[in-house]
């Protein structure tokens, strides 16, 4: 489910932790499941090139075959290239694995543009820079695809970390993380720190870049500053959450909060942009344009198509507003807000102008399938997917890109009434609820 604007993604160099480290609040420490403190073996285990996805190294089969796998919280299949493809340097060779078991079942996943299809099986899987365990997991061996793999992206498969409800061909196919938790003593929690580059990377830098961390089984306190704030997972399919208010530079968009979650709001590491429902997008862009009106940009820029360039080092970050999303809190009538900077929502693009320029794409876009909090949001924060307690945590990422005047923020509590009314109830039909290829 990664086409349209879902992928390619962006990652890049993880700079040193920037800005002041806030004193850690300890009132929630006891509530955090899993191992606490350091997961040093998992830190910096993600890589990625600008706009092309965050991936983790995994091994499948016996003897182990090493593959780079895209980390995607917006889908639920573990699927890997299993046949030659022009864009793949390597692929899973089932015939070389003594532990491969064929499930004698096919899987077909169409997108708005493109598709992948393959054959289901199980095999032994491990994550070299992850927990020291090997699990038997379902694998979709991709035998045919169209517009799925990305030339030069360096990943050969996708790790869907969402819930079984949206697995293909149906919810009986156990997702990888469920298998991992079931077969080991690893707590039912993982966390992601995606580190955006914040500046255009040349090819040498991009290839050598550190993309971030996927911590399996807990929370690493070195990856964030301040405290973690949690929002309930509304329903276990996608990682669905509820947005209760949106502000641009502190100005409320003043829309019925149902609009923000029409038809859902999800946290998706497999999407590049912050994607907003049509009405919300239009209101947000109008507000962002007004806030940055000392300079005008072509319509194509606001559509995410044209690039705008400034002489290297002169990007006028100060003219662009911050974007704040208020999320339902864990306590009744309480919310918290996450605030991102233009350094997150203006996505650096390399190799288009000259080395004397910094060029960017506007990475907020329109959606017909609800709000998608993609890399644009996640690169500002350390995001905890606390499946055990059915909640998602946000804290300011230690690697987020900012300047001397503003920083990304996670702040609360705020009093917000009737937040339950903000959720949209999708009418039940006989058709599958999975909307692939969110255009």
């Amino acid at each position: 489910t990664h086409l349209g604007i879902r992928l390619p993604l962006r990652s890049g160099l993880a700079g040193p932790p920037l800005g002041l480290r806030l004193p850690r609040e300890t009132d929630e420490e006891s509530e955090e499941p899993g191992r606490r403190g350091s997961f040093v073996e998992m830190v910096d285990n993600l890589r990625g090139k600008s706009g092309q996805g965050y991936y983790v190294e995994m091994t499948v089969g016996s003897p182990p075959q090493t593959l780079n796998i895209l980390v995607d919280t917006g889908s639920s299949n573990f699927a890997v290239g299993a046949a030659p493809h022009p864009f793949l340097h390597r692929y899973y060779q089932r015939q070389l694995s003594s532990t491969y078991r064929d499930l004698r079942k096919g899987v077909y996943v169409p997108y708005t543009q493109g598709k992948w299809e393959g054959e289901l099986g199980t095999d032994l899987v491990s994550i070299p820079h992850g927990p020291n365990v090997t699990v038997r997991a379902n694998i979709a061996a991709i035998t045919e695809s169209d517009k799925f793999f990305i030339n030069g992206s360096n990943w050969e498969g996708i790790l869907g970390l969402a819930y079984a409800e949206i697995a293909r061909p149906d919810d009986s196919l156990e997702p990888f993380f469920d298998s991992l938790v079931k077969q080991t003593h690893i707590p039912n929690i993982f966390s992601l720190q995606l580190c955006g580059a914040g500046f255009p990377l040349n090819q040498t830098e991009a290839l050598a870049s550190v993309g971030g961390s996927m911590i399996i089984g807990g929370i690493d306190h070195s990856l964030y500053t301040g405290r973690l704030w949690y929002t309930p997972i509304r329903r276990e399919w996608y990682y669905e959450v509820i947005i209760v208010r949106v502000e641009i530079n502190g100005q409320d968009l003043k829309m019925d909060c149902k609009e923000y979650n029409y038809d859902k709001s999800i946290v998706d590491s497999g999407t590049t942009n912050l994607r907003l429902p049509k009405k919300v997008f239009e209101a947000a862009v109008k507000s962002i344009k007004a806030a940055s009106s000392t300079e005008k940009f072509p319509d194509g820029f606001w559509l995410g198509e044209q690039l705008v360039c400034w002489q290297a080092g002169t990007t006028p970050w100060n003219i662009f507003p911050v974007i704040s999303l208020y999320l339902m809190g864990e306590v009744t009538n309480q919310s918290f807000r996450i605030t991102i900077l233009p350094q997150q929502y203006l996505r650096p693009v390399e190799d288009v102008a000259t080395s004397q320029d910094d060029c960017y794409k506007f990475a907020v876009s329109q959606s017909s399938t609800g709000t998608v909090m993609g890399a644009v949001i996640m690169e500002g924060f350390y995001v905890v997917f606390d499946r055990a307690r059915k909640r998602i945590g946000f804290a300011v990422s230690a690697c987020h890109v900012h300047d001397e005047f503003r920083t990304a923020a996670v702040e609360g509590p705020f009093v917000t009434a009737d937040m339950e009314d903000c959720g949209y109830n999708i009418p039940q039909t006989d058709e599958s609820t999975l909307m692939t290829g969110r255009a």
């Epitope: 000392t294 300079e295 005008k296 940009f297 072509p298 319509d299 194509g300 820029f301 198509e305 044209q306 690039l307 705008v308 360039c309 190799d351 288009v352 102008a353 060029c359």
Partner: antibody, heavy 120, light 108 residues
């Protein structure tokens, strides 16, 4: 009908500063719908973009000329100006001012151009 | 840097003939491309914007096509006043900065 007219000296000595002004008539330079720009064309050669300005004073310059170029706007006179310092013979060209319309994307209206020769 | 390459450098044709001019970008510029006409001693004039839209007052014999990296300006039947130099320009990277080297359409 909106028109653009370049003015300024036709001869500039090497190492001096080239100064040109573009007067906008038949419309307001303060329109929020346009940027205003300078383009040049050396004799017998192609077009080279120099830079743009918005009525608010926001500027964009060609990186290859950035260190020598200043574009400014005077909304009270309905004019915008170009200054190019430390000129050499390579700066000899016809200099055009133009309006960047069609959603700030395309140079849809041009002045007639003025030839500036750099010579001692 | 995006480079625009125009071909041919010179096109020798007779009035009434069809002219086909090419502009190739070194990487995709989507549909953000314009065509200009320049006659000797005159300023350039915008003919086509967004790859295929005719600018105000431009005759229907001028048409533009293409997207991505390959673009074409077609003059369906050359009139005497069409003999000029034609330039393409990309605005995918903004502000617009890159012009092609030009194609001269001359009388055969």
């Amino acid at each position: 009908q909106l028109q653009l007219q370049e003015s300024g000296p036709g001869l500039v000595k090497p190492s001096e500063t080239l100064s040109l002004t573009c007067t906008v008539s038949g419309g307001s330079i303060s329109s929020s719908s346009y940027y205003w720009g300078w383009i040049r064309q050396p004799p017998g050669k192609g077009l080279e973009w120099i830079g743009n300005i918005y009525y608010s004073g926001s500027t964009y310059y060609n990186p290859s000329l950035k260190s020598r170029v200043t574009i400014s706007v005077d909304t009270s006179k309905n004019q915008f100006s170009l200054k190019l310092s430390s000129v050499t013979a390579a700066d000899t060209a016809v200099y055009y001012c133009a309006r960047l319309g069609h959603g700030y994307n395309y140079f849809d209206l041009w002045g007639r151009g003025t030839l500036v020769t750099v010579s001692s | 840097e995006i480079v625009l390459t125009q071909s041919p450098a010179t096109l020798s044709l007779s009035p009434g003939e069809r002219a086909t001019l090419s502009c190739r970008a070194s990487q995709s510029v989507s549909s953000y491309l314009a065509w200009f006409q320049q006659k000797p001693g005159q300023a350039p004039r915008l003919l086509i914007y967004d790859a295929s839209n005719r600018a105000t007052g431009i005759p229907a014999r001028f048409s533009g096509s293409g997207s991505g990296t390959d673009f074409t300006l077609t003059i369906s039947s050359l009139e005497p006043e069409d003999f000029a130099v034609y330039y393409c320009q990309q605005v995918y990277v903004w502000p617009p900065r890159t012009f092609g080297g030009g194609t001269k359409v001359e009388i055969k």
